[in-house]
Amino acid sequence: QRTDSIPNSPDNIPLRGGNCSEDLLCILKRAPFKKSWAYLQVAKHLNKTKLSWNKDGILHGVRYQDGNLVIQFPGLYFIICQLQFLVQCPNNSVDLKLELLINKHIKKQALVTVCESGMQTKHVYQNLSQFLLDYLQVNTTVSVNVDTFQYIDTSTFPLENVLSVFLYSNSD
Amino acid sequence: QRTDSIPNSPDNIPLRGGNCSEDLLCILKRAPFKKSWAYLQVAKHLNKTKLSWNKDGILHGVRYQDGNLVIQFPGLYFIICQLQFLVQCPNNSVDLKLELLINKHIKKQALVTVCESGMQTKHVYQNLSQFLLDYLQVNTTVSVNVDTFQYIDTSTFPLENVLSVFLYSNSD
Amino acid sequence: QRTDSIPNSPDNIPLRGGNCSEDLLCILKRAPFKKSWAYLQVAKHLNKTKLSWNKDGILHGVRYQDGNLVIQFPGLYFIICQLQFLVQCPNNSVDLKLELLINKHIKKQALVTVCESGMQTKHVYQNLSQFLLDYLQVNTTVSVNVDTFQYIDTSTFPLENVLSVFLYSNSD
């Protein structure tokens, strides 16, 4: 996790209402330019449909807990998830699904059918992404669900499977 | 549509040139930090190649009219559209196309071929997205065109079909 | 390339440490609201796996040189590339790959298998995108590699193949 001191970090903006008087830097810091973001890669070992993530990714103004990104500053967030699948085709088609959940509610999902020819081939790659623009309150959780988690390629390409959020406009 | 009072809303930034003198908050509000955004889901019933959208989505500093997002503040916009298709495969391949139009001109399109095996299967899911970064002037229209609109899955997955724009950098 | 004068352009922010005293506009301009972005379309004629781009696209606070975007201002960048493929299917499946490279290191890749039925068809369209959120230093290079560059559709759809970056949060 990066710990660089970044201007306008949510951590160093004084609370509104404090005494700022004519201190221009203080006034500027109070201005609504907060930034929050996260970029996490999938955990190496997946054993359930709710994906887990490596908490040593980029986290700034967002917490990670038990497979969830937890929002710390309210506002309008852009959320994007991208997954790389590697499917050993059975003799039927396979529907790959990616669900974005907000507070455990499905807000958006993407589906793609692979192995549609019904032929057993060595492997089929598929890349699936999903984005969402939504107002999120403090303590809102963001998570990802994948029915066919066994097809997520975590051994060769763990870095390709990511969940990212960033604050577009805060609503203090 | 959210009506929360959001700092730096295009609606409450005073016009430049007004008398601000030493009012720091006024000066800050004049600073170029405007934000505009939209996030609309596809209308339930589609009957033409130009897609219609639910106007009760998120709209802030952008208008919706007759299938178009209409820009109200000039600047550099990030535009992204994502569509979920569900195709009842005929006995030939099908090309799915998503066109992003600016002022009725095609600015970007994405194509994916499905049902390529030529076998009539129950269904094939496909997810298609397209983004664009472009300078847009006031009253510019943003719209989406899809040849095969009958395959857009508005019944099972109406929330998956979205058009979103947000202002990255204003150009006042 | 757009040359509009855009507020808070990296070009017109005075260096920190200069004497600003009580000049509020000067103070505001010093505040960390720099923006940098690029949006380039693929070059018409590709002859190697490292893609080349049309340098007459949108470039602001980012340079283009020899197939690379070169970062001029440090910070957290959102990087996104989208490519449109048109594959004349041989009698075997084809793996399409898109790699995002930072300083010649693979940071993220996307793979999709097409022509999986093994049938020689007229053509198959496939659209592939990849994004990355990363901290980039000054002079960092961003480039794109595609093993099967011969399948990138530069003739019918040159505008669909784009590389874009934008600064989300600067780190001055």
């Epitope: - | - | 490292k50 490279l101 693979i106």
Partner: antibody
Framework: QVQLQESGPGLVKPSETLSLTCTVS????????WSWIRQPAGKGLEWIGR???????NYNPSLKSRVTMSVDTSKNQFSLKLNSVTAADTAVYYC??????????????????WGQGTTVTVSS | QSALTQPASVSGSPGQSITISCTGT?????????VSWYQQHPGKAPKLIIY???NRPSGVSNRFSGSESGNTASLTISGLQAEDEANYYC??????????FGGGTKLTVL
């Protein structure tokens, strides 16, 4: 400390299939990709291909049509099969550990751990 | 995929420095910073001495250094010693997600 040991028949008849196994000890096979390399007597190294537990394989284009690789995680082994062999396939065959993934990036070390090699002769 | 090009042989006296070049294409050395170098003594398995163009694995002498320019990578051995006499191979990752080796260079310490 990770160690690799190749095993398999030292003599294979022309047109038959060469089968080799590499046993990994001192570490998990799941955390890396694994390669096979060969070296004909007095000549240079030739990379044959790479495998991993995901089933994702990459092969030298010149050998692709004849090569199959796989991983057996339960035995901590990976294997090479090369069919339709000829005298030109006579060589010392090495197994090696390939690239690593850590700390939010890929590390393309090349082959950082090697087996001692096994000689395979193709002859009738 | 074509092999990378190395000189068949180089030689030097103890204490001298020598450089071995390795030339590839824009789809391997020119594309990635994924060049590695191996030392192989007769009858032994190769040993990794440089990875990712310039990095030395732990335990490898700092007399070995790597560099790169354009489509060419180089291995420099300074303060040549008798035990450096061996075959040296360069290798690069390629755009096809494969590795390609050089033909090898025989280093003779005079």
């Amino acid at each position: 400390q990770v160690q690799l040991q190749e095993s398999g028949p030292g003599l294979v008849k022309p047109s038959e299939t060469l089968s080799l196994t590499c046993t990994v000890s001192g570490g998990s096979i799941s955390s890396y990709s694994w390669s096979w390399i060969r070296q004909p007597a007095g000549k240079g190294l030739e990379w044959i291909g790479r495998t991993s537990t995901s089933g994702r394989n990459n092969y030298n284009p010149s050998l692709k049509s004849r090569v199959t690789m796989s991983v057996d995680t339960s035995k901590n082994q990976f294997s090479l099969k090369l069919n339709s062999v000829t005298a030109a396939d006579t060589a010392v065959y090495y197994c090696a550990r390939d690239f690593t993934i850590a700390a939010r990036r890929y590390y393309y070390y090349g082959m950082d751990v090697w087996g001692q090699g096994t000689t395979v002769t193709v002859s009738s | 995929q074509s092999a990378l090009t190395q000189p068949a042989s180089v030689s030097g006296s103890p204490g001298q420095s020598i450089t071995i070049s390795c030339t590839g294409t824009s789809s391997d050395i020119g594309l990635y910073n994924y060049v590695s170098w191996y030392q192989q003594h007769p009858g032994k398995a190769p040993k990794l001495i440089i990875y990712e163009v310039i990095n030395r694995p732990s335990g490898v002498s700092n007399r070995f250094s790597g560099s790169e320019s354009g489509n060419t990578a180089s291995l420099t051995i300074s303060g040549l010693q008798a035990e450096d006499e061996a075959n040296y191979y360069c290798s690069s990752y390629t755009s096809s997600s494969t590795w390609v080796f050089g033909g090898g260079t025989k280093l003779t310490v005079l």
